[in-house]
Protein backbone atom coordinates (compact mmCIF):
# COMPACT_ATOMS: atom_id res chain seq x y z
CA UNK A 1 0.00 0.00 0.00
CA UNK A 2 1.02 3.63 -0.36
CA UNK A 3 2.82 4.48 2.88
CA UNK A 4 1.51 7.64 4.56
CA UNK A 5 4.83 9.40 4.04
CA UNK A 6 4.55 9.03 0.25
CA UNK A 7 2.21 11.80 -0.80
CA UNK A 8 -0.35 10.99 -3.49
CA UNK A 9 -0.57 14.28 -5.34
CA UNK A 10 -3.58 15.39 -7.37
CA UNK A 11 -3.74 13.89 -10.89
CA UNK A 12 -0.63 11.86 -10.15
CA UNK A 13 -0.37 9.03 -12.66
CA UNK A 14 3.10 8.14 -11.39
CA UNK A 15 1.50 6.31 -8.46
CA UNK A 16 -0.68 3.45 -9.70
CA UNK A 17 -2.39 1.13 -7.25
CA UNK A 18 -4.45 -2.03 -7.51
CA UNK A 19 -7.76 -2.64 -5.74
CA UNK A 20 -5.92 -3.44 -2.50
CA UNK A 21 -3.99 -0.16 -2.66
CA UNK A 22 -0.66 -1.85 -3.41
CA UNK A 23 1.66 0.32 -5.47
CA UNK A 24 2.45 -1.07 -8.91
CA UNK A 25 6.04 -0.82 -10.05
CA UNK A 26 6.95 0.30 -13.57
CA UNK A 27 7.70 -2.00 -16.45
CA UNK A 28 11.23 -2.56 -17.76
CA UNK A 29 11.21 -2.36 -21.55
CA UNK A 30 13.54 -2.14 -24.49
CA UNK A 31 13.38 1.47 -25.65
CA UNK A 32 15.33 2.32 -28.79
CA UNK A 33 12.54 4.12 -30.67
CA UNK A 34 12.87 3.41 -34.42
CA UNK A 35 15.93 1.55 -35.71
CA UNK A 36 16.73 -0.13 -39.01
CA UNK A 37 16.35 -3.88 -38.75
CA UNK A 38 17.45 -7.03 -40.55
CA UNK A 39 14.55 -9.03 -39.09
CA UNK A 40 12.70 -10.55 -42.05
CA UNK A 41 11.01 -13.89 -42.81
CA UNK A 42 11.84 -15.27 -39.37
CA UNK A 43 9.67 -16.91 -36.72
CA UNK A 44 11.14 -14.61 -34.10
CA UNK A 45 13.76 -11.90 -33.82
CA UNK A 46 15.74 -10.19 -31.11
CA UNK A 47 15.40 -6.42 -31.04
CA UNK A 48 19.17 -5.77 -30.93
CA UNK A 49 18.28 -2.82 -28.73
CA UNK A 50 20.83 -2.31 -25.97
CA UNK A 51 18.75 0.22 -24.03
CA UNK A 52 16.47 -1.06 -21.29
CA UNK A 53 14.40 1.71 -19.72
CA UNK A 54 12.25 2.02 -16.66
CA UNK A 55 8.95 3.08 -18.16
CA UNK A 56 8.02 6.54 -16.98
CA UNK A 57 4.55 5.56 -15.78
CA UNK A 58 3.68 2.28 -14.02
CA UNK A 59 0.67 1.64 -16.27
CA UNK A 60 2.84 1.58 -19.40
CA UNK A 61 3.68 -1.69 -21.15
CA UNK A 62 6.35 -2.74 -23.64
CA UNK A 63 5.60 -2.29 -27.34
CA UNK A 64 7.37 -3.33 -30.54
CA UNK A 65 6.45 -2.23 -34.06
CA UNK A 66 7.90 -3.94 -37.16
CA UNK A 67 7.46 -2.18 -40.49
CA UNK A 68 8.57 -3.13 -43.99
CA UNK A 69 8.23 -1.07 -47.14
CA UNK A 70 9.96 -0.98 -50.54
CA UNK A 71 13.00 0.75 -49.06
CA UNK A 72 13.71 -0.70 -45.63
CA UNK A 73 12.68 -2.60 -42.52
CA UNK A 74 12.44 -0.87 -39.16
CA UNK A 75 11.81 -2.05 -35.62
CA UNK A 76 10.49 0.34 -33.00
CA UNK A 77 10.71 -0.45 -29.29
CA UNK A 78 9.01 1.77 -26.70
CA UNK A 79 6.95 2.00 -23.52
CA UNK A 80 3.33 3.02 -24.00
CA UNK A 81 0.12 3.36 -22.00
CA UNK A 82 -2.31 0.65 -23.22
CA UNK A 83 -5.26 2.94 -22.51
CA UNK A 84 -4.06 5.10 -25.40
CA UNK A 85 -3.83 4.00 -29.06
CA UNK A 86 -0.40 3.64 -30.62
CA UNK A 87 -0.01 4.28 -34.36
CA UNK A 88 -3.81 4.53 -34.30
CA UNK A 89 -4.19 0.97 -32.99
CA UNK A 90 -5.36 -0.29 -29.59
CA UNK A 91 -2.87 -2.45 -27.68
CA UNK A 92 -5.11 -5.52 -27.40
CA UNK A 93 -2.49 -7.89 -25.98
CA UNK A 94 -0.95 -5.60 -23.36
CA UNK A 95 -1.30 -8.17 -20.56
CA UNK A 96 0.57 -10.88 -22.50
CA UNK A 97 3.97 -11.94 -21.11
CA UNK A 98 5.27 -12.40 -24.68
CA UNK A 99 5.38 -9.98 -27.60
CA UNK A 100 3.34 -11.81 -30.23
CA UNK A 101 3.31 -9.82 -33.46
CA UNK A 102 -0.03 -9.20 -35.15
CA UNK A 103 -0.42 -7.67 -38.58
CA UNK A 104 -2.27 -4.38 -38.88
CA UNK A 105 -3.62 -2.79 -42.04
CA UNK A 106 -1.45 0.12 -43.13
CA UNK A 107 -1.38 1.34 -46.74
CA UNK A 108 1.95 1.09 -48.56
CA UNK A 109 3.72 -1.11 -46.02
CA UNK A 110 3.64 -4.31 -44.02
CA UNK A 111 2.97 -3.40 -40.40
CA UNK A 112 3.14 -5.67 -37.35
CA UNK A 113 2.74 -4.64 -33.74
CA UNK A 114 2.87 -6.35 -30.35
CA UNK A 115 2.65 -5.36 -26.71
CA UNK A 116 3.45 -7.24 -23.51
CA UNK A 117 3.93 -6.95 -19.76
CA UNK A 118 7.03 -8.73 -18.55
CA UNK A 119 10.64 -7.61 -18.14
CA UNK A 120 12.16 -6.61 -21.50
CA UNK A 121 9.50 -8.69 -23.27
CA UNK A 122 9.76 -6.52 -26.41
CA UNK A 123 13.34 -7.72 -26.85
CA UNK A 124 12.09 -10.98 -28.38
CA UNK A 125 9.42 -10.39 -31.00
CA UNK A 126 7.50 -13.45 -32.18
CA UNK A 127 5.95 -13.85 -35.62
CA UNK A 128 5.59 -17.63 -35.45
CA UNK A 129 2.10 -18.83 -36.36
CA UNK A 130 1.98 -21.35 -33.52
CA UNK A 131 1.49 -18.44 -31.10
CA UNK A 132 -1.16 -16.70 -33.18
CA UNK A 133 -4.04 -19.13 -32.77
CA UNK A 134 -6.35 -16.27 -31.83
CA UNK A 135 -6.40 -15.43 -35.54
CA UNK A 136 -9.63 -16.95 -36.99
CA UNK A 137 -8.14 -17.35 -40.50
CA UNK A 138 -5.24 -19.27 -39.03
CA UNK A 139 -7.59 -21.54 -37.08
CA UNK A 140 -9.31 -22.41 -40.37
CA UNK A 141 -5.97 -23.40 -41.86
CA UNK A 142 -5.04 -25.46 -38.80
CA UNK A 143 -8.29 -27.41 -38.71
CA UNK A 144 -8.68 -28.02 -42.46
Amino acid sequence: TIPPHVQKSVNNDMIVTDNNGAVKFPQLCKFCDVRFSTCDNQKSCMSNCSITSICEKPQEVCVAVWRKNDENITLETVCHDPKLPYHDFILEDAASPKCIMKEKKKPGETFFMCSCSSDECNDNIIFSEEYNTSNPDLLLVIFQ
Epitope: D18, A22, V23, K24, F25, L28, I54
Partner: nanobody
Framework: EVQLLESGGGLVQPGGSLRLSCAAS???????RMWWARQAPGKGLEWVS?????????YYADSVKGRFTISRDNSKNTLYLQMNSLRAEDTAVYYC????????????WGQGTLVTVSS
Protein backbone atom coordinates in the same frame (compact mmCIF):
# COMPACT_ATOMS: atom_id res chain seq x y z
CA GLU B 1 9.36 -7.78 10.43
CA VAL B 2 10.53 -6.25 7.15
CA GLN B 3 12.39 -2.98 7.60
CA LEU B 4 14.03 -0.60 5.12
CA LEU B 5 15.99 2.34 6.50
CA GLU B 6 17.42 4.99 4.19
CA SER B 7 20.27 7.31 5.11
CA GLY B 8 22.80 9.60 3.46
CA GLY B 9 20.58 12.47 2.41
CA GLY B 10 21.44 16.08 3.02
CA LEU B 11 22.19 19.46 1.48
CA VAL B 12 24.59 19.51 -1.46
CA GLN B 13 25.60 22.10 -4.03
CA PRO B 14 24.78 21.66 -7.74
CA GLY B 15 27.38 19.44 -9.35
CA GLY B 16 28.09 17.70 -6.08
CA SER B 17 27.72 14.07 -5.03
CA LEU B 18 25.90 12.04 -2.40
CA ARG B 19 25.66 8.36 -1.61
CA LEU B 20 22.40 7.04 -0.24
CA SER B 21 22.16 3.77 1.68
CA CYS B 22 19.19 1.56 2.46
CA ALA B 23 19.66 -0.99 5.24
CA ALA B 24 17.30 -3.94 4.82
CA SER B 25 16.19 -6.57 7.32
CA UNK B 26 13.44 -9.11 7.87
CA UNK B 27 13.53 -10.73 4.42
CA UNK B 28 15.90 -12.56 2.08
CA UNK B 29 17.62 -9.51 0.66
CA UNK B 30 19.59 -11.25 -2.08
CA UNK B 31 16.38 -12.74 -3.52
CA UNK B 32 14.60 -9.40 -3.95
CA ARG B 33 14.70 -6.86 -6.74
CA MET B 34 15.21 -3.49 -5.11
CA TRP B 35 14.27 -0.02 -6.29
CA TRP B 36 14.95 3.63 -5.58
CA ALA B 37 12.12 6.09 -6.10
CA ARG B 38 11.91 9.78 -5.36
CA GLN B 39 9.27 12.41 -4.76
CA ALA B 40 9.95 16.11 -5.27
CA PRO B 41 7.86 18.58 -3.26
CA GLY B 42 4.32 18.70 -4.67
CA LYS B 43 5.18 16.25 -7.45
CA GLY B 44 4.42 12.62 -8.17
CA LEU B 45 6.54 9.62 -7.36
CA GLU B 46 9.34 9.03 -9.89
CA TRP B 47 10.99 5.63 -10.28
CA VAL B 48 14.72 6.29 -10.40
CA SER B 49 16.56 2.99 -10.51
CA UNK B 50 16.27 -0.75 -9.97
CA UNK B 51 18.69 -3.59 -9.42
CA UNK B 52 17.94 -7.24 -10.13
CA UNK B 53 18.20 -9.98 -7.55
CA UNK B 54 20.24 -12.19 -9.88
CA UNK B 55 23.22 -10.92 -11.82
CA UNK B 56 22.86 -7.42 -10.38
CA UNK B 57 21.49 -6.08 -13.66
CA UNK B 58 20.74 -2.38 -13.22
CA TYR B 59 18.05 -0.13 -14.68
CA TYR B 60 17.75 3.66 -14.72
CA ALA B 61 15.21 6.33 -15.55
CA ASP B 62 16.32 8.58 -18.41
CA SER B 63 16.47 11.55 -16.05
CA VAL B 64 19.35 10.03 -14.03
CA LYS B 65 21.15 7.84 -16.59
CA GLY B 66 24.90 8.42 -16.55
CA ARG B 67 24.76 10.32 -13.26
CA PHE B 68 23.35 7.84 -10.73
CA THR B 69 24.61 4.33 -9.97
CA ILE B 70 22.62 1.74 -8.05
CA SER B 71 24.42 -1.12 -6.31
CA ARG B 72 23.89 -3.62 -3.55
CA ASP B 73 26.00 -5.46 -1.00
CA ASN B 74 24.18 -8.68 -0.23
CA SER B 75 26.59 -9.54 2.58
CA LYS B 76 25.54 -6.34 4.36
CA ASN B 77 21.88 -6.42 3.25
CA THR B 78 22.33 -2.89 1.97
CA LEU B 79 21.22 -1.05 -1.17
CA TYR B 80 23.09 2.02 -2.41
CA LEU B 81 22.50 4.93 -4.75
CA GLN B 82 25.57 6.91 -5.78
CA MET B 83 24.41 10.28 -7.09
CA ASN B 84 26.87 12.42 -9.04
CA SER B 85 26.53 15.71 -10.96
CA LEU B 86 23.52 16.59 -8.86
CA ARG B 87 21.07 19.19 -10.15
CA ALA B 88 18.42 21.32 -8.46
CA GLU B 89 15.73 19.11 -10.02
CA ASP B 90 17.14 16.11 -8.12
CA THR B 91 15.85 17.68 -4.89
CA ALA B 92 13.39 15.15 -3.45
CA VAL B 93 12.72 12.62 -0.75
CA TYR B 94 14.36 9.36 -1.87
CA TYR B 95 12.78 6.02 -0.94
CA CYS B 96 14.02 2.48 -1.30
CA UNK B 97 11.43 -0.18 -1.98
CA UNK B 98 11.38 -3.95 -2.11
CA UNK B 99 9.54 -5.56 -4.98
CA UNK B 100 7.01 -8.05 -3.69
CA UNK B 101 7.18 -11.75 -4.32
CA UNK B 102 4.21 -11.47 -6.66
CA UNK B 103 6.51 -9.47 -8.96
CA UNK B 104 3.64 -7.09 -9.52
CA UNK B 105 3.66 -4.65 -6.65
CA UNK B 106 5.78 -2.94 -4.04
CA UNK B 107 4.99 -4.24 -0.60
CA UNK B 108 7.61 -2.56 1.58
CA TRP B 109 8.99 0.99 1.62
CA GLY B 110 11.49 2.89 3.64
CA GLN B 111 10.66 6.16 5.38
CA GLY B 112 12.75 8.16 2.92
CA THR B 113 15.75 10.48 3.11
CA LEU B 114 15.68 14.09 1.93
CA VAL B 115 18.17 15.27 -0.68
CA THR B 116 18.36 19.03 -1.25
CA VAL B 117 20.45 20.38 -4.12
CA SER B 118 20.94 24.10 -3.73
CA SER B 119 23.66 26.73 -3.83
Amino acid sequence: EVQLLESGGGLVQPGGSLRLSCAASGFTFDAARMWWARQAPGKGLEWVSAIADIGNTTYYADSVKGRFTISRDNSKNTLYLQMNSLRAEDTAVYYCAKQSGSEDHFDYWGQGTLVTVSS
